[in-house]
Interface confidence: low
């Protein structure tokens, strides 16, 4: 039975040209995390594999940095980066846990972080 929950940074906003950290945390399970995928809609941005480490999609090499931890740092943000981001935790023996983050990239200099929330 899948008992874990994913805590994410929730709905967040950031300034155009700036950077943002996408973070997810899996709790309430003893399952082993074998790989974490970071996806934007249907596009794979990066993977962090327990055995083989980090790999960033060639399309995003210049603007995506691994970490901190299992998180992902997006740099040189553009308005086109606005949208849904997913952290997908592949675990054994539980299976897959998915967390959702909505990022809004703002033209203005006012960008506030949303509250953290949980997805069971």
């Amino acid at each position: 039975m899948m008992t874990g929950t994913i805590e994410t940074t929730g709905n967040i906003s950031a300034e155009k040209g700036g950077s943002i950290i996408l973070q997810c945390h899996l709790s309430s399970t003893t399952a082993q995390v074998t790989q974490v995928n970071w996806e934007q809609q249907d596009q794979l941005l990066a993977i962090c594999n327990a055995d083989l480490g980090w790999h960033i999609s060639p399309s995003f090499k210049d603007r995506v940095a691994p970490g901190p931890g299992l998180g992902l740092t997006l740099q040189s943000l553009t308005v086109n980066d606005t949208g849904e981001y997913f952290c997908i935790y592949h675990t054994y023996p539980d299976g897959t846990y998915t967390g959702r983050i909505f990022l809004e990239v703002l033209e203005s200099s006012v960008a506030e972080h949303g509250a953290r929330f949980q997805i069971p």
Partner: antibody
Framework: EVQLLESGGGLVQPGGSLRLSCAAS????????MNWVRQAPGKGLEYVAS????????YYADSVKGRFTISRDNSKNTLYLQMNSLRAEDTAVYYC??????????????WGQGTTVTVSS | QSVLTQPPSASGTPGQRVTISCSGG????????VSWYQQLPGTAPKLLIY???KRPSGVPDRFSASKSGTSASLAISGLQSEDEADYYC???????????FGGGTKLTVL
């Protein structure tokens, strides 16, 4: 069109050497992990070796470790397999295969037509 | 002997649904992704399923797959004569640090 074309196979005596090549076209070769997989006559698929984008990380099946070397030349869009100390059991069709969707070990989505290696005296 | 275990043969009649199993361990299927390949006689293997359940473009939705624990399965519905081929499962093995394949299943369409 995405294509892989192997070459370099042939007949070689036990203990001999052979170098296989795989010419890639139709995709950005330097973005992908690449693999060699072989198939002995009438048998199933057997993993041989893998290499990461820049050639800095390699993996081998135990059966070829220390004898085979996988390498790549991204400027020539070519994958290589240097095979030394060949044995009769290395006789097989050798396929090069590209990893799917840039990430490693999700699956191999493009395969070459294969090149035949026969080890016999 | 292959690290992943598949039945050597399977068969079905046109229109039928057939399932091919693939059994492994925690270092491969249990902890990593499964892919499936079809090899028609005299040709190179073709990717059917990757990342356990996803189909590359061009692969009919008659082909589907699933995974549970350390086992995986490939299902082919609406069986057609052109489905007669060898089918292989594969997974990365974290202990061996390399790919492992099943021994292959020869599918016969009766």
């Amino acid at each position: 069109e995405v294509q892989l074309l192997e070459s370099g196979g042939g007949l070689v005596q036990p203990g001999g050497s052979l170098r296989l090549s795989c010419a890639a076209s139709g995709f950005t070769f330097s973005d992908y992990y690449m693999n060699w997989v072989r198939q002995a006559p009438g048998k199933g698929l057997e993993y041989v070796a893998s290499i990461n984008w820049n050639g800095g990380t390699t993996y081998y099946a135990d059966s070829v470790k220390g004898r085979f070397t996988i390498s790549r030349d991204n400027s020539k869009n070519t994958l290589y397999l240097q095979m030394n100390s060949l044995r009769a059991e290395d006789t097989a069709v050798y396929y090069c295969a590209k990893d799917q969707n840039w990430n490693f070990y999700y699956g191999m989505d493009v395969w070459g037509q294969g090149t035949t290696v026969t080890v016999s005296s | 002997q292959s690290v992943l275990t598949q039945p050597p043969s399977a068969s079905g009649t046109p229109g039928q649904r057939v399932t091919i199993s693939c059994s492994g361990g925690s270092s491969n299927i249990g902890n990593n992704f499964v892919s499936w390949y079809q090899q028609l006689p005299g040709t190179a293997p073709k990717l059917l399923i990757y990342n356990e359940i996803k189909r590359p473009s061009g692969v009919p939705d008659r082909f589907s797959a699933s995974k549970s624990g350390t086992s995986a399965s490939l299902a082919i519905s609406g069986l057609q004569s052109e489905d007669e081929a060898d089918y292989y499962c594969a997974s990365w093995d974290g202990s061996l640090r390399g790919w492992v394949f099943g021994g292959g299943t020869k599918l016969t369409v009766l």
